[in-house]
């Protein structure tokens, strides 16, 4: 007769393993015993587990609640036991041995590979802001056994950089993602992607990217300056800018005080009917964490009655 | 035909020693793992202590752990169990018995006593 | 350490009558159990082991069932040279632990 078992036996954590373990032997031949033992190199053998012919299963007390036999039907030839809910301890050497009558002993060793899936974890790097230089925009971990696999999925151009540490049953991969930030990556995902044989499919942890940026400000309203003429009513300024954050607007004239009966909305200066008083220069101040720009105009409300048109000057700085 | 044949009992005071002998006879005594078991007058069966095959594992009884030590020379077919501080309560009759060899090479379990002596008295009184 | 409990402690029996004694223990032990015979004055004696297997040389009339916790000592037709009182033990865990003990008297 001969044993057969498998070279190595694979479970993810926390799951229950088979240590298959089944006597092919002729006919009328018996198994008395199976007994089941690790025996891991450098360390004495430890007994795991006894089938015997009459008593039955035995569990050692190191194991004790931890191993059954497979459900019926059995085998008398089988010797094979279930080890539940397996740890990253139980990895490691398994020893079944078998006494048969007539034919003797036999015994045939196993690996036991216990995979701990990782719990992967994303980090950001620091705040995000348009004309740095290559800056960390996020680093991925993952420990694992065997060591996972950390992989980035995204349409922004970047770089990336891994290291590995060693632990005693275990590794940590870690992997970071640089980049240049410019504002067209703002709101662009960035997905770290974590293998392992562990896992039935691959993990993903996706980070939105956030780019703080402001850019210039500009004036709309007095593109035809004809417009602006006494008595024209629904006459406004609008302040245009785009930012990350979303930008503040405010409104000043830089000449005196706002004229009574003009409305100031966010990025919009709404104007009462206009009068000679309303001309002046006026300025939008545009402002978020990252910077600030101002606009400045200068509105000239024409009289009708005067022949000549006066000019506008349109004036932007920062 | 087994026989095993104990010896060594008697009187003896409390804190005193004594070394009880079993010897063993029609069988191979070294294949098999042999017990102590006592039993105190009137009550019940109390295992004692028992050794494996070549006397590398032994265990014993809480009752009797750090006082009592079993031990066995294969060569002179002899299970020997030495009595330290000795207590009024270790009194009875002490057995030698040997396991049924029906389990190989698994230290965590014992098997069934299949022949046993004829006792010996142990009398521990002041 | 298992606790091997015994019932009954006594009991009075006449000859030819079946007669069947319990034990249990105190966690599961699959048939790692024996049953002994013990006469006043003698060694006990090995009648089954393995909780149901039969000693060789003991009487047919003797028999075990049981496994995990419940074990069942019978005779089927009590013999004059039955009685006798009669012991489980487990074996299961170190240390082997044996129940109180059940006396079987002449009614």
């Known amino acids: 007769g001969e044993l057969e078992t498998s070279d190595v036996v694979t479970v993810v954590l926390g799951q229950d393993a088979k240590l298959p373990c089944f006597y092919r032997g002729d006919s009328g031949e018996q198994v008395g015993q199976v007994a089941w033992a690790r025996v891991d190199a450098g360390e004495g053998a430890q007994e795991l587990a006894l089938l015997h012919s009459k008593y039955g299963l035995h569990v050692s007390p190191a194991y004790e609640g931890r191993v059954e036999q497979p459900p019926p039907p059995r085998n008398p030839l089988d010797g094979s036991v279930l080890l539940r809910n397996a740890v990253q301890a139980d990895e490691g050497e398994y020893e079944c041995r078998v006494s048969t009558f007539p034919a003797g002993s036999f015994q045939a060793r196993l690996r036991l590979r216990v995979l701990v899936p990782p719990l992967p974890s994303l980090n950001p790097g620091p705040a995000l802001e348009e004309g740095q230089g290559l800056t960390l925009a996020a680093s991925c971990t993952a420990e694992g056994s065997p060591a996972p696999s950390v992989t980035w999925d995204t349409e922004v151009k970047g770089t990336t950089s891994s290291r590995s540490f060693k632990h005693s049953r275990s590794a940590a991969v870690t992997s970071e993602f640089h980049l240049v930030p410019s504002r067209s990556m703002n709101g662009q995902p960035l997905t770290c992607v974590v293998s392992h044989p562990g896992l039935l499919q691959d993990q993903r942890i996706t980070h939105i990217l956030h780019v703080s940026f402001l850019a210039e400000a500009s004036v709309r309203g007095l593109e035809d300056q004809n417009l602006w003429h006494i008595g024209r009513e629904g006459a406004m300024l609008k302040c245009l800018s785009e930012g990350q954050p979303p930008p503040s607007y405010n409104w000043t004239r830089l000449d005196g005080p706002l004229p009574s009966g003009v409305r100031v909305d966010g990025d919009t200066l709404g104007f009462p009917p206009l009068t000679t008083e309303h001309s002046g220069i006026y300025v939008c101040h545009v402002s978020n964490e990252f910077s600030s720009r101002d606009s400045q105009v200068t509105v000239d409300v024409l009289d009708p009655q005067e022949d000549s048109g006066k000019q506008v000057d349109l004036v932007s700085a920062s | 035909e087994v026989q095993l044949v104990e010896s060594g009992g008697g009187l003896v005071q409390p804190g005193g020693s004594l070394r009880l002998s079993c010897a063993a006879s029609?069988?191979?005594?070294?294949?098999?793992?042999m017990s102590w078991v006592r039993q105190a007058p009137g009550k019940g069966l109390e295992w004692v202590s028992g050794i494996k095959t070549y006397g590398g594992n032994t265990h014993y009884a809480d009752s009797v752990k750090g006082r009592f030590t079993i031990s066995r020379d294969n060569s002179k077919n002899t299970l020997y169990l030495q009595m330290n501080s000795l207590r009024a309560e270790d009194t009875a009759v002490y057995y030698c018995?040997?396991?049924?060899?029906?389990?190989?090479?698994?230290?965590?379990?014992?098997?069934?006593?299949?022949?046993w002596g004829q006792g010996t008295l142990v009398t521990v009184s002041s | 350490d298992i606790q091997m409990t015994q019932s009954p402690s006594s009991l009075s029996a006449s000859v030819g009558d079946r007669v069947t004694i319990t034990c249990r223990a105190s966690?599961?032990?699959?048939?790692?159990l024996a049953w002994y015979q013990q006469k006043p004055g003698k060694a006990p004696k090995l009648l089954i082991y393995a909780a149901s297997s039969l000693q060789s040389g003991v009487p047919s009339r003797f028999s075990g069932s049981g496994s995990g916790t419940d074990f069942t000592l019978t005779i089927s037709s009590l013999q004059p040279e039955d009685f006798a009182t009669y012991y489980c033990q487990q074996h299961y865990t170190t240390p082997p632990t044996f129940g109180q003990g059940t006396k079987v008297e002449i009614k």
């Open positions: 029609g069988y191979n005594f070294g294949s098999y793992d």
């Open positions: 966690q599961g032990i699959s048939s790692y």
């Open positions: 018995a040997r396991e049924y060899s029906d389990v190989v090479d698994y230290v965590s379990v014992r098997t069934p006593l299949d022949y």
